[in-house]
Interface confidence: low
């Protein structure tokens, strides 16, 4: 109670009322005045919001009663006015004044969690003490009461692994958490207000607690040694098959690389990015005859691992590939990529040309059996020895091109084909001949010595650097003498007369026999003829209307 | 200081099963593997499988695979070894040990051991 | 047969130098950690060396522990009496999916 400094004044309180009583007649305090001397001259009256439906004050007294129950929450203040008036007169004995009627609090409301549902996320492996997430819980009673709304939070579900600050709600890790075990955990919050005390509400809430991956386990191969065959016709670059390591760990921690550890040429691993698996890949054509299997040692790591998580990874896992390379029946190989041969002309049939020789480069060695495609003058045997069946002559081909084919005995499908080149060597075998036709003509009025022809031979057999003809005149025409030869022993030769003066009434033409002979060996010798007219001719002595005369004659006309 | 602590010796006849117990204190026991390995008598030791106490995982050695069954009680904290079918070979000292929170970390721990005689 | 494979014994003269070794292959040694193990005669086994090559608290600096390949080897220098046990390694094995043990080595402190 207090009194005014003014000697007329209100003694009063401020009152205070509980929540929530159950009995509707509650005293909560007199309201008196100091004038009042108590013989019941004044009467008291309660105005303001709530007063007679809430509250009402015996007048004769001043006492102030609850007469319904209150709900602090609902409303904690109510501001009353309150007047004192002589009954007597009906006047004012002290001017109105207000007072204020304070709701006490009681623990009537549970701790709420009005932001669930709590999740949170945190990785695996983390250390005691990480900081999970803080939960809030909310109390509608009165913070200033006393403990009414002091919360402690505790955990109900969730231990060893999670701990929660009493008094804050921060959820902590108390145990390290390995997601591969478990990846998430539902722990259960309570919150007690009354500090825990006896006769405290709580609260509960849930809290899903996931553990994101970490990069603590290593890939491991499924298997110790895998078993790959590829076929020795496979072409670079083919898949040969795929080997599989597991990793407990998820996402980009489980993203691999595979490796060889050998510096292997032969073989490659590649990883597929989808399935995690390595592709064994041919990095170079295989050959089973050389090597018929391959043993490698491949290896597999994380593709992403944080430098603190190295000791998870110290070891690389490794495994074995034994790549089993599949025979491929292969066509036989020539032992030359093209073969040369020679042969003279005019050998005998049956003559030896050379011989061929192939073989099946696989394992089985099957017999090779030879053939020569469309030719009439060679054939082959099942030695691979190539004969003549028909005579040769260098002078119609000097050259024949054989496709020669090699097929495997006990698989016929497998033919190789070579090239045969066969050169025809050249013998002595034609006699050198004019190389054209020659008509002589010669003056009457001629001398001796005089040019009338220069002749030159060919020969049908190949002409080599030193071949050289000889020119002579036949035994008859040398003694006739009306004509002599010199050989300019450059295969040509002229023809000059051997005296004065021709008589073409008495002997218009001579037919002179030239015989030619080459240098080969044997040496053949041919006879040609060279026919020379005699002409009346000119005083400038041209031949030209001889040999006009000629050509009108050979055209069937007749001159006089 | 990580106390492991194992029950008491046994003597079985041959065909029978004993059951091992071995309580663990001073430790967050169910962030921890534990072992069971044992050692018959002037022998050297053999491992023979591993419990996670949290979810009761198991994993055997192959030898004891179908004859060895580990269980874990997180109210008391406490990992049990039951070995059936006993054979005078399985006369030996087991113990468990606390293994780290990965199957693969060391064993720190050991306990006292307890010795099984298997005879008839 | 161990799947590690260890010499029954060694022995040596106080203040020696002793190597215990232990052989395996890639699944185990090759891939995993190795640990080292002493027990004493009539005791549970004691953990010496993990991980390779780290001593737990109040293991003497006189044990060391290293790894090559697919072996690891136990180093005691200074050899004392109190050393007399046996040591045993042990490491996961990837491919049994499980522990394996060496089948131990008894050494002898002589004189």
């Known amino acids: 109670d207090y009194k005014d400094d003014d000697d007329k004044g209100w003694m009063w309180n401020q009152f205070f009322v509980p929540e929530e009583m159950n009995k509707t007649d509650y005293h909560i305090g007199q309201l008196r005045s100091d004038l009042d001397n108590g013989n019941n001259s004044f009467q008291y009256k309660l105005l303001g919001a709530g007063a007679g439906s809430t509250f009402i004050i015996d007048e004769r007294t001043g006492d102030i009663y609850a007469i319904e129950k209150l709900d602090r929450e609902e409303r904690s203040l109510y501001i009353l006015r309150a007047q004192v008036i002589d009954s007597t007169t009906g006047r004012a004995v002290e001017p109105e004044s207000e007072f204020v009627i304070r709701v006490s609090d009681i623990n009537d409301n549970e701790p709420k969690f009005l932001d669930e549902p709590y999740e949170a996320i945190v990785p695996e492996m983390s250390p005691e003490g990480t900081l999970v997430i803080q939960v809030t819980a909310t109390d509608a009673d009165d913070p200033a009461s006393g403990n009414n709304a002091r919360l402690l939070y505790s955990l109900l579900q969730g231990q060893p692994y999670f701990s929660i600050e009493p008094t804050t709600g921060v959820i902590r890790i108390s145990s390290k958490m390995d997601r591969e075990l478990q990846d998430e955990y539902w722990v259960i919050i309570q919150a007690k207000d009354m500090i825990g005390l006896p006769g405290a509400l709580s609260g509960t809430t849930s809290v899903l607690i996931k553990l994101s991956d970490v990069n603590d386990n290593k890939p491991i191969f499924k298997e110790r040694l895998y078993r790959l065959t590829v076929s020795e016709s496979a072409p670079t670059g083919t898949s040969i098959g795929r080997i599989m390591a597991y990793d407990n760990d998820i996402g980009e921690n489980a993203e691999m690389d595979y490796s060889i550890e050998d510096d292997s040429q032969t073989f490659d691993i590649i990883t597929n990015n989808e399935t995690q698996e390595g592709i064994v890949i041919l990095k170079k054509k295989v050959d089973f005859e050389h090597q018929n299997h391959y043993l490698i040692r491949a290896n597999v790591k994380n593709r992403h691992v944080a430098e603190h998580l190295m000791e998870y990874h110290v070891e690389a896992s490794t495994t074995f590939v034994r790549v089993q390379v599949e025979d491929e029946d292969e066509p036989p190989v020539f032992l030359l990529p093209y073969y040369l041969f020679e042969i003279l002309e005019e050998s005998p049939h049956g003559s030896f040309v050379g011989m061929v020789s192939a073989t099946d480069p696989d394992q089985r060695k099957s017999p090779i059996r030879y053939s020569i495609t469309r030719s009439k003058v060679f054939s082959i045997d099942d030695n691979g020895t190539i004969i003549t069946t028909n005579p040769l002559d260098r002078e119609i081909s000097a050259w024949y091109n054989l496709s020669i084919t090699a097929t495997e005995k006990y698989n016929v499908q497998q033919i190789s084909a070579v090239p045969v080149y066969v050169q025809v060597l050249n013998i002595n075998d034609h006699a050198p001949e004019f190389s054209e036709y020659y008509d002589s003509y010669v003056c009457e009025n001629a001398g001796s010595g005089q040019v009338i022809q220069t002749i030159s031979a060919v020969d049908r057999d190949e002409s080599v650097e030193d071949h050289h003809f000889y020119f002579n005149l036949s035994v008859e025409d040398t003694k006739n003498s009306s004509f002599i030869i010199i050989d300019n022993e450059d295969n040509t030769a002229v023809i000059l007369t051997n005296r004065t003066g021709f008589s073409l009434q008495e002997e218009p033409v001579f037919y002179i026999s030239v015989l030619i002979a080459d240098n080969g060996i044997p040496s053949l010798t041919s006879t040609n003829t060279l026919t020379i007219h005699i002409c009346d001719c000119d005083d400038y002595g041209s031949t030209q209307t001889c040999r006009d005369k000629d050509l009108l004659l050979s055209m069937g006309f007749r001159t006089e | 200081q990580v106390q492991l602590v194992q029950s008491g010796a046994e003597v079985k006849k041959p065909g029978a099963s004993v059951k091992v117990s071995c309580k663990a204190s001073?430790?967050?026991?169910?962030?921890?593997?534990m072992s069971w390995v044992r050692q018959a008598p002037g022998q050297g030791l053999e491992w023979m499988g591993i419990?996670?106490?949290?979810?009761?995982?198991?994993t055997y050695a192959q030898k004891f695979q179908g004859r060895v069954t580990m269980t874990g009680d997180t109210s008391t904290s406490t990992v049990y070894m039951e070995l059936s079918s006993l054979r005078s070979e399985d006369t030996a000292v087991y113990y468990c040990?606390?293994?780290?929170?990965?199957?693969?970390?060391?064993?720190?721990?050991w306990g006292q051991g307890t010795l099984v005689t298997v005879s008839s | 047969h161990s799947v590690l494979t260890q010499s029954p014994s060694a022995s040596g003269t106080p203040g020696q130098r002793v190597t215990i070794s232990c052989s395996g292959s890639?699944?185990?040694?090759?891939?995993?950690?190795v640990n080292w193990y002493q027990q004493l005669p009539g005791t549970a086994p004691k953990l010496l060396i993990y991980?390779?090559?780290q001593r737990p608290s109040g293991v003497p600096d006189r044990f060391s522990g290293s790894k090559s390949g697919t072996s690891a080897s136990l180093a005691i220098s200074g050899l004392q009496s109190e050393d007399e046990a046996d040591y045993y390694c042990?490491?996961?094995?990837?491919?049994?999916?499980?522990?394996?043990f060496g089948g131990g080595t008894k050494l002898t402190v002589l004189g």
């Open positions: 419990i996670h106490p949290s979810g009761g995982d198991t």
């Open positions: 001073r430790y967050t026991f169910t962030s921890y593997y």
């Open positions: 991980t390779n090559n």
């Open positions: 040990a606390r293994g780290g929170i990965k199957l693969w970390l060391h064993f720190d721990y």
């Open positions: 042990a490491v996961w094995d990837d491919s049994l999916n499980g522990w394996v």
């Open positions: 890639r699944s185990n040694i090759g891939s995993n950690f």
